[in-house]
Interface confidence: low
């Protein structure tokens, strides 16, 4: 790595993957193992994130980018960048301080994470319930009761939604 020749900041020419080494007369030195610099002109390299325990490595650290973690099976990521792993529950459940609990009547959760939410109130939109809700699925709203006169064409309910895959948030 050659010394930079910038008249302003001698470190500005140090590319990503290097740092401006004050101990070596501001020469651009490569980041040491298990560290990285994602932008040029940095005076230090950042320590790579380590994916340990319930975290597993999704992308290895390189000299120019940090490692990325996700969660081992049975857990899912929380927070931007997967800062925490939280236990999965089944669809129709939510995670409480006492573990996974079934959704109360009138609420549902169609994911393996997150909280149970109330069923949609079809009547607020002047509609009727076409398909009843369950612990795993929201209700399906259909036409307003007035539209369902004898002889009106029947409405086919949608096919059941497939199980969502999952590595959310």
């Amino acid at each position: 790595f050659e010394r930079t020749r910038s008249l302003q900041d001698p470190c500005s020419n140090c590319p990503a993957g290097t740092f401006c080494d004050n101990n070596r007369n501001q020469i651009c030195s490569p980041c040491p193992p298990n560290s990285f610099s994602s932008a040029g002109g940095q005076r230090t390299c950042d320590i790579c994130r380590q994916c340990k325990g319930v975290f597993r490595t999704r992308k290895e650290c390189s000299s120019t980018s940090n490692a990325e973690c996700d969660c081992t099976p049975g857990f899912h990521c929380l927070g931007a960048g997967c800062s925490m792993c939280e236990q999965d529950c089944k669809q129709g459940q939510e995670l409480t301080k006492k573990g996974c609990k079934d959704c109360c009547f009138g609420t549902f959760n169609d994911q393996k994470r997150g909280i149970c939410r109330p069923w949609t109130n079809c009547s607020l939109d002047g509609k009727s319930v076409l398909v009843n809700g369950t612990k795993e699925r929201d209700v399906v709203c259909g036409p307003s009761p007035a539209d369902l006169s004898p002889g009106a064409s029947s409405v086919t309910p949608p096919a059941p939604a497939r199980e969502p895959g999952h590595s959310p948030q």
Epitope: G79, A80, G114, I115, T120, P164, G165, H166, S167, Q169
Partner: antibody, heavy 111, light 110 residues
Framework: SLEESGGRLVTPGTPLTLTCTAS????????MNWVRQAPGKGLEYIGI?????SAYYASWAKGRFTISRTSTTVDLRITSPTTEDTATYFC?????????WGQGTLVTVSS | AQVLTQTASSVSAPVGGTVTISCQSS????????LSWYQQKPGQRPKLLIY???TLAFGVPSRFKGSGSGTEFTLTISDLECDDAATYFC??????????FGGGTEVEVK
């Protein structure tokens, strides 16, 4: 990352569909949102679509917008744009904290 | 309809100082804690800072602190840096998949 596309200049009443595409993760695993921001204004929430395809809208947005999804994209249809709908439209992922946002796509409605 | 009010449209404080941004909800947010905070700089997309009222998003410095429950929430930024100059939005979630943003508070760092 997320990327919105489809924003352009349209005349009032001309339907427009915006598309959100993901790279680096599977869209189908996430609840996805649409949010808009008029020039110089704050953020305005439009609606959310669940991983199983159920869409929920802000009260002001019902009937004016339709959110749908495929395994690889999430779409926002502006059914009958008015000049009031001129804004940057963002898609964002997550249902209890939107941790990833697109850069936005500008929709201008003008006659 | 649910309304989130950020009382101050702008606040300012010196570098190294502390600012507090309040967000008041007209109704209790879902689960008492379904509230997020976002930072947005001009011409940029919003960035998640806090979710579940007080949980710090990944990569966000611990200088940012969210607190509150039910209808009253606060974002506190301590040890202010020039880079914190931005507009901050709260966002609440309510029963029935209703989400609302506050009007935003602009933070000026002197």
């Amino acid at each position: 990352s997320l990327e919105e596309s489809g924003g352009r200049l349209v005349t009032p009443g001309t339907p427009l569909t915006l598309t959100c595409t993901a790279s680096g993760f599977s869209l189908s695993n996430y609840y996805m949102n649409w949010v808009r921001q008029a020039p110089g204004k704050g953020l305005e929430y439009i609606g959310i679509i669940s991983s199983s395809g159920s869409a929920y809208y802000a009260s002001w947005a019902k009937g004016r917008f339709t959110i749908s999804r495929t395994s690889t994209t999430v779409d926002l249809r502006i059914t009958s744009p008015t000049t009031e709908d001129t804004a940057t439209y963002f898609c964002a992922r997550g249902d209890y904290g939107m941790d990833l946002w697109g850069q936005g796509t500008l929709v201008t409605v003008s006659s | 309809a649910q309304v989130l009010t950020q009382t101050a449209s702008s606040v300012s404080a010196p570098v190294g100082g502390t600012v507090t941004i309040s967000c008041q909800s007209s109704q209790t947010v879902y689960n008492n804690n379904l509230l997020s905070w976002y930072q947005q700089k001009p011409g940029q997309r919003p960035k998640l800072l806090i979710y579940y009222a007080s949980t710090l998003a990944f990569g966000v410095p611990s200088r940012f602190k969210g607190s509150g429950s039910g209808t009253e929430f606060t974002l506190t930024i301590s040890d202010l840096e020039c880079d914190d100059a931005a507009t901050y939005f709260c966002q609440g979630g309510y029963s029935g998949w209703i989400y609302v943003f506050g009007g935003g508070t602009e933070v000026e760092v002197k």
